[in-house]
């Protein structure tokens, strides 16, 4: 019928399975005058034929491994053989069948692995090729360990990435392999095509001999370094060693200190570069890193601990130039006058900071010397001899020596003798009445002024009044500030008032002195006052239990997964409706009633993490007041981005003809998270047919070298497909194309005659 099997001349693509004998025509092209006949050119391989009337067919079975795409051209000719239409491209894509078995490149592989190597880090690759199409199951290879010898306690120490053939240690292997116990292992590896999923798959096996070597990349013991060292710096304090020579060592200061006093040389020796000061910083934690020649970490970093040992390099210091205490005239012997607390910057709870107190002088020495004593270790001053008389000596000055084991410091104490505290504070009002306030009254507002008076000596601890709320405010919503000159008390709001929990509060104040009352005098009802606080209701917005809610999920969670929840309460007890605001990516939904948050779309860490949205809690009914909180969703990475080329590699060229095999270096990247060690890609050619001409070899985790296997290339562009595997969980693979042009060169650049200036390669090899 017209359309599927016949029609006018136009560019077309047909797909035909390889290995099948021809059973039907491919297409019947229809000629329009003056066209009379058709002509077929291109990669016909004497298989494709067009009859004069336009019947395109093939005369024998195709082989995809010989040619996967036949690029043909069909032209319509007039009666004289002149092209009147076309030529148009006709593409025959040869579809793969599983007619090739996988074969290992080597019948035996040998490798070595360090003990304690990171689980999952490849140390050896087995590589099989299958000429079938890698884009179909026919060419998709599946590697498996058939047997591990010896097998200890039925535990596998080795694992293989079934897609890439990368052999690595299991967690058990990383922990238990020990060259002293068993220095060598043998693995039998199988490879199957059809992704290992079919009983009709072809297979091959190979043997792998593995030597276990000692791992010397270990964190050294913590180092102790005495502060203020006078030895010549730098001083070697410890060392690390990579397992092989040639590693490049560096230190990483995770704390980002303004002064980082450590260095490492290329032997792995670690030095302190200047004297340390324990009082500035008493311990350092930093990391030693070993990298390869391309700057890629060879393994995990080692944590280095340096403790700075104290020396007694700080004298005691006084709390202030003069410390003032008061003592009443009738103070009893042994009473505490106050405590002098000196400081020492040296290490706490050591002899370097352990202080002794001693009174070295008292002035005046009236009526005698030695009126006071100080507790040697506590610094507490006590009255030692007799009651003091203010009219005789209103003030004493003490010089106190404070010492550690090496240093002495003099501190000065002034002791004022004051009247006895025999008068209690008396409120001018015992009841300050009722006060009505709205619950949203501002914090810091003064709501009441109270006043008591005390007849004792002015401006001493005996007459100073301190007001306390002793009843009716267990939440601590109120406070009282005292004016030291007038002893006036100002009642202020310290925390929000709340109608819902405390509509009426019966507040009781107590007025007292900082100095103790003399024996026999007690505070009575005169020192107490009350008032009643009435709080009126204000409709308040709901209150979230947190300012920021945070949840953490893997970026590949199934749609509909609960990823977090928020809670809010309405002070008036109304129901709350939850909603989301700012869900710009449309990833989330919230249950209006419960506040549970669910995913409604695939999440993507690479689009940005954490994902921040606002949650809104709104009163249901009432005045519909609402409040807002933040919800931060931290997305944990999964390996969901295939590797790709790190930059645009168009313009690679070799000068034709090649005088010797050449090579070029390319870099891969992907968008997943790689934390400290960076990506560990593996590289291989994208199809078996490229193996005769090209070779790809890994340089490090991100770079590889593409090399020519010979020099017999045509002067044209070659598109080399490279397969890059990220070795992640699950491993992802990208097939990228590197276009490489072989061209005539003038002065090392690709020569293009005038008029052919498009797409000139710019990178020569």
């Amino acid at each position: 019928q017209e359309g599927k099997f016949s029609g006018p001349l136009k560019p077309m693509t047909f797909s035909i399975y390889e290995g099948q004998e021809p059973s039907q025509i491919i297409f019947q092209f229809k000629a329009n005058p003056p066209a009379v006949t058709f002509e077929l050119t291109g990669e016909t391989d004497n298989i494709f034929v067009i009859e004069r009337e336009g019947l395109l067919y093939y005369n024998r079975a195709l082989d995809r491994e010989t040619r996967s795409t036949h690029n043909l051209q069909v032209a319509a000719l007039d009666a004289n053989g002149i092209i009147v239409e076309g030529p148009v491209p006709i593409t025959i894509k040869v579809k793969d069948i599983n007619d090739n078995r996988p074969t290992f490149l080597q019948s035996k592989y040998e490798g070595s692995v360090r003990q304690n190597s990171r689980p999952g880090k490849p140390f050896l690759y087995v590589n099989a090729t299958d000429l079938d199409d890698p884009a179909t199951p026919n060419g998709q290879l599946y590697y498996q360990i058939v047997i591990q010898l010896p097998m200890i306690n039925n535990v596998m120490y080795f694992q293989i990435n079934n897609k890439t053939g990368a052999i690595s240690l299991t967690r058990e292997g990383s922990q238990e392999l020990n060259p002293a116990k068993n220095p060598s292992y043998n693995l039998v590896i199988s490879v199957k095509d059809m992704g290992g999923q079919s009983e009709n798959s072809f297979s091959d096996t190979t043997s792998v001999d593995i030597i276990v070597t000692e791992n010397i990349w270990k964190a050294p013991k913590p180092v102790e370094m005495v502060e203020n060292s006078t030895d010549p710096h730098p001083i070697k304090i410890t060392q690390v060693r990579w397992n092989d020579p040639g590693a490049q060592y560096s230190l990483v200061d995770k704390e980002k200190l303004p002064r980082f006093p450590f260095s490492i040389d290329q032997e792995g020796d670690i030095y302190v570069t200047q004297p340390l000061d324990r009082e500035e910083k008493d311990a350092y934690v930093f990391y030693a890193v070993a990298k390869d020649e391309y700057g890629k970490p060879l393994s995990y970093p080692l944590e280095i601990h340096v403790k700075v040992k104290d020396i007694n390099d700080n004298p005691p210091t006084c709390p202030s130039p003069v410390t003032v205490f008061e003592v009443q005239e009738n103070e009893r012997l042994g009473n505490s006058i106050g405590t002098l607390t000196a400081h020492d910057r040296d290490e706490e709870n050591t002899a370097n900071s352990f202080l002794n107190y001693r009174i070295v002088e008292q002035t005046p020495k009236l009526p005698m010397d030695g009126l006071f004593l100080i507790q040697t270790y506590a610094g507490m001053l006590q009255l030692a001899k007799q009651s003091l008389k203010k009219q005789d000596t209103p003030q004493y000055n003490l010089t106190i020596e404070v010492s550690d084991k090496d240093f002495k410091t003099l501190c000065f104490v002034q002791i004022n003798v004051i009247d006895i505290n025999d008068q209690i504070p008396i409120f001018e009002k015992s009841d300050y009445g009722n006060l009505t306030l709205a619950e949203d009254t501002n914090i810091g507002s003064t709501i009441l002024t109270i006043q008591a008076t005390d007849a004792d000596e002015p401006f001493t601890g005996s007459s100073k009044i301190l007001y306390h709320i002793i009843k009716g405010d267990s939440e601590g919503r109120l406070g009282v500030d005292t004016d030291p000159h007038t002893n006036t008390g100002y009642v202020i709001i310290k925390k929000p008032l709340d109608f819902e929990t405390a509509a009426v509060s019966n507040i009781v104040f107590k007025a007292e002195n900082p100095e103790p009352l003399v024996f026999g005098v007690k505070y009575n009802a005169s020192s107490f006052a009350k008032f009643t606080l009435i709080v009126t209701d204000v409709n308040e917005a709901p209150q979230f239990s947190q300012h920021v809610f945070q949840a953490k999920v893997s970026e590949d969670v199934a749609i509909g997964t609960k990823v977090g929840n928020v809670t809010a309460k309405d002070p008036e007890g109304l129901d709350i409706s939850y909603s989301l605001r700012g869900d710009t990516r449309g990833w989330l939904k919230i249950d209006h009633v419960t506040g549970e948050i669910f995913s409604v779309a695939p999440l993507d860490r690479e689009a940005g993490s954490p994902y921040r949205v606002q949650v809104v809690a709104t009163e249901v009914g009432g005045s519909s007041l609402s409040s807002v909180s933040e919800f931060h969703l931290i997305l944990m990475d999964v390996n969901d981005n295939p590797p790709r080329l790190a930059k645009d590699y168009t313009g690679l060229f070799f000068c034709h003809p090649l005088s010797a095999p050449g090579s070029l270096i390319f870099e891969a990247t992907d968008d997943d998270q790689h934390l400290f060690r960076g990506p560990h890609f593996t590289f291989s050619l994208g199809s078996g047919s490229l193996q005769n001409d090209w070779e790809v070899s890994k340089i490090n985790g991100t770079h590889a070298r593409l090399s020519t296997r010979h020099t017999e290339f045509e002067e044209r562009e070659y598109v080399v497909l490279i397969r890059i595997n990220d070795g992640g969980r699950p491993p992802l693979e990208g097939i990228v194309s590197l276009p490489v042009t072989f061209c005539s060169c003038v002065e090392g650049s690709c020569f293009r005659p005038a008029g052919h200036q498009t797409g000139i390669p710019t990178v020569g090899m």
């Epitope: 005058p33 003056p34 009379v36 006949t37 002509e39 050119t41 004069r52 051209q73 007039d78 009666a79 004289n80 053989g81 002149i82 092209i83 030529p87």
Partner: antibody, heavy 119, light 112 residues
């Protein structure tokens, strides 16, 4: 066997027209194109154009457009060329030839028709 | 239009010897199908032209194998080995790659 038989010589006056014929035999007339060439005395060959009898399609040399008109009569297996507005410059021998389809060889020629334009 | 050039108006030759007649084109006559669209004709005195060579190097039916054609895309040679008296006449090359078809000016073969 294949033959192309052209009409006899013509003597015509300037400004007149002439129609010369080329009758074919020995093959299916509509299967192959007929080409016409001219050759002035003592000079080389010039291609005038062709006609494909099956479709009636033609193609002319720009230098002969308006001068020559090619037609074909499949019932009599005859191709015609009419020359208009003749001048002495048009005095020449005119050949027809077959272009064999699919092989594209100009393998058989007529014996030629001499046209003389003179007052 | 493609210009066909036959530089030598005539070539003298002794019977039994070989001779080459050349022709050039202003554009390559080689098409992507690998064929070169060039004819060689011989026009004997008082006769119609006769096809000798098609597609640059293929001998036409009934033509003696003393005639052969060769060339690149733009330079062509007709070679006659062991020339005979009946070979005299004017030899024309003609391109049929594209319209209008064009002839060379002809090279006359003369017997010494």
């Amino acid at each position: 066997q294949v033959q192309l038989q052209q009409s006899d010589a013509e003597l015509v006056k300037p400004g007149a027209s002439v129609k010369i014929s080329c009758k074919v035999s020995g093959y299916t007339f509509s299967d192959h194109a007929i080409h016409w060439m001219s050759q002035r005395p003592g000079q080389g060959l010039k291609w005038i154009g062709y006609i494909y009898p099956r479709h009636g399609t033609t193609n002319y040399n720009e230098n002969f457009k308006g001068k020559a008109t090619l037609t074909a009569d499949t019932s009599s297996s005859t191709a015609y060329m009419q020359l208009n507005s003749l001048t002495s410059e048009d005095s020449a021998v005119y050949f027809c030839a077959r272009m064999r389809n699919y092989f594209y060889v100009m393998d058989y020629w007529g014996q030629g028709t001499s046209v003389t334009v003179s007052s | 239009d493609i210009v066909m050039t036959q530089a030598a108006p005539s070539v003298p030759v002794t019977p039994g010897e070989s001779v080459s007649i050349s022709c050039t084109s202003s554009k390559s006559l080689l098409r992507s199908n690998g064929n070169t669209y060039l004819y060689w004709f011989l026009q004997r005195p008082g006769q119609s032209p006769q096809l000798l060579i098609y597609r640059m190097s293929n001998l036409a039916s009934g033509v003696p194998d003393r005639f052969s054609g060769s060339g690149s895309g733009t330079a062509f040679t007709l070679r006659i080995s062991r020339v005979e008296a009946e070979d005299v006449g004017v030899y024309y090359c003609m391109q049929h790659l594209e319209y209008p078809f064009t002839f060379g000016s002809g090279t006359k073969l003369e017997i010494k």
